[in-house]
Interface confidence: medium
């Protein structure tokens, strides 16, 4: 698997992973204790033809062009968890692994 990495200075228009730091305090999410902010990343850009398409199905659907189908979108194709310290529903503070919190790779799907 392959994905492009960009930054705020990139001129790349194709589907790319960009850095993004999420700040929970700025959201007012005080039930998250740590980390108060983390590197989440995000996907943005155009999906032309077969560029970075994760599944052959994506290309085939686009070719067949059934009614109501949209073109492929730039979306996470690989994500990873982070460890967080947070209040659970029972007012306990828990240290736990939360899945799919970080975008590791972007592609077209």
């Amino acid at each position: 698997d392959f994905g492009l990495d960009c930054d705020e200075h990139s001129t790349e228009s194709r589907c790319c992973r960009y850095p993004l730091t999420v700040d929970f305090e700025a959201f007012g999410w005080d039930w998250i204790i740590a980390p108060k902010r983390y590197k989440a990343n995000y996907c943005s850009g155009e999906c032309e033809f077969v560029f970075l398409q994760k599944y052959p199905h994506t290309h085939l659907v686009h070719q067949a062009n059934p009614r109501g189908s949209a073109g492929p979108c730039c979306t996470p194709t690989k994500m990873s968890p982070i460890n967080m310290l947070y209040f659970n529903g029972k007012e306990q503070i828990i240290y736990g692994k939360i899945p799919a919190m970080v975008v590791d790779r972007c592609g077209c799907s």
Partner: antibody, heavy 125, light 107 residues
Framework: QVQLVESGPGLVKPSETLSLTCTVY??????????WGWIRQPPGKGLEWIGT???????YYNPSLKSRVTMSVDTSKNQFSLKLSSVTAADTAVYYC?????????????????WGQGTTVTVSS | AIQMTQSPSSLSASVGDRVTITCRAS??????LGWYQQKPGKAPKRLIY???SLQSGVPSRFSGSGSGTEFTLTISSLQPEDFATYYC?????????FGQGTKVEIK
């Protein structure tokens, strides 16, 4: 290398408020990846976590002490403080300040490292 | 609060001995456990984090194992500087709690 140094009175009278300060040297207390805490150890006994505070002022306390504990941060002095009200002889202990580190990748957390050298507080009239 | 029970509370051993200290948690804490060494008049020093990872600068004779509710600190060959009190710490659920300590003395 970050160093933590506790300061405050060594003797407090029963029913009064114990006040301690921890000064952080060699690093900024405002760094977003660090949390600051207090741990105590009564003479000849084990360790008890008192609470932890973030530089923004968010604090989390041990429920067993919560009604008596207040922690605060003074970023201008690179210090954080502990106040423990209505003390009794059972609060006689060595009080340590500590640092926690939470990596913004969310993959590596480091509890209670480093520690201050500890300061002895005796509650007695 | 999660209770951490250490055993034994004290032990006597000789230089070169293999020493094992156990820590039991009152509920599942995954791998969220550290081991600390404390010498008289000094602040504790962390030896092991995440149940089995060796702190940088700590001799390899120290090792940790376990997960869930049962954990072990092993000193493979006790050295004169290892005579101290050892504490486990759970950091799975607030409040963080320590074991009551194991004092390792010279036989």
């Amino acid at each position: 290398q970050v160093q933590l140094v506790e300061s405050g009175p060594g003797l407090v009278k029963p029913s009064e408020t114990l006040s301690l300060t921890c000064t952080v040297y060699g690093g900024s207390i405002s760094s977003g990846n660090y949390y600051w805490g207090w741990i105590r150890q009564p003479p000849g006994k084990g360790l008890e976590w008192i609470g932890t505070i973030y530089y923004s002022g968010s604090a989390y306390y041990n429920p067993s002490l919560k009604s008596r504990v207040t922690m605060s941060v003074d970023t201008s002095k690179n210090q954080f403080s502990l106040k423990l009200s209505s003390v009794t002889a059972a609060d006689t202990a060595v009080y340590y300040c500590v640092r926690d580190y939470y990596d913004s990748s969310g993959h590596y957390y480091n509890w209670f490292d480093p520690w201050g050298q500890g300061t002895t507080v005796t509650v007695s009239s | 609060a999660i209770q951490m029970t250490q055993s034994p509370s004290s032990l006597s051993a000789s230089v070169g001995d293999r020493v094992t200290i156990t820590c039991r948690a009152s509920q599942d804490i995954r791998h969220d456990l550290g081991w600390y060494q404390q010498k008289p008049g000094k602040a504790p020093k962390r030896l092991i984090y995440a149940a089995s990872s060796l702190q940088s600068g700590v001799p390899s004779r120290f090792s940790g194992s376990g997960s869930g509710t049962e954990f072990t600190l092993t000193i493979s060959s006790l050295q004169p500087e290892d005579f101290a009190t050892y504490y486990c710490l759970q950091h799975n659920t607030y409040p963080w709690t320590f074991g009551q300590g194991t004092k390792v003395e010279i036989k």
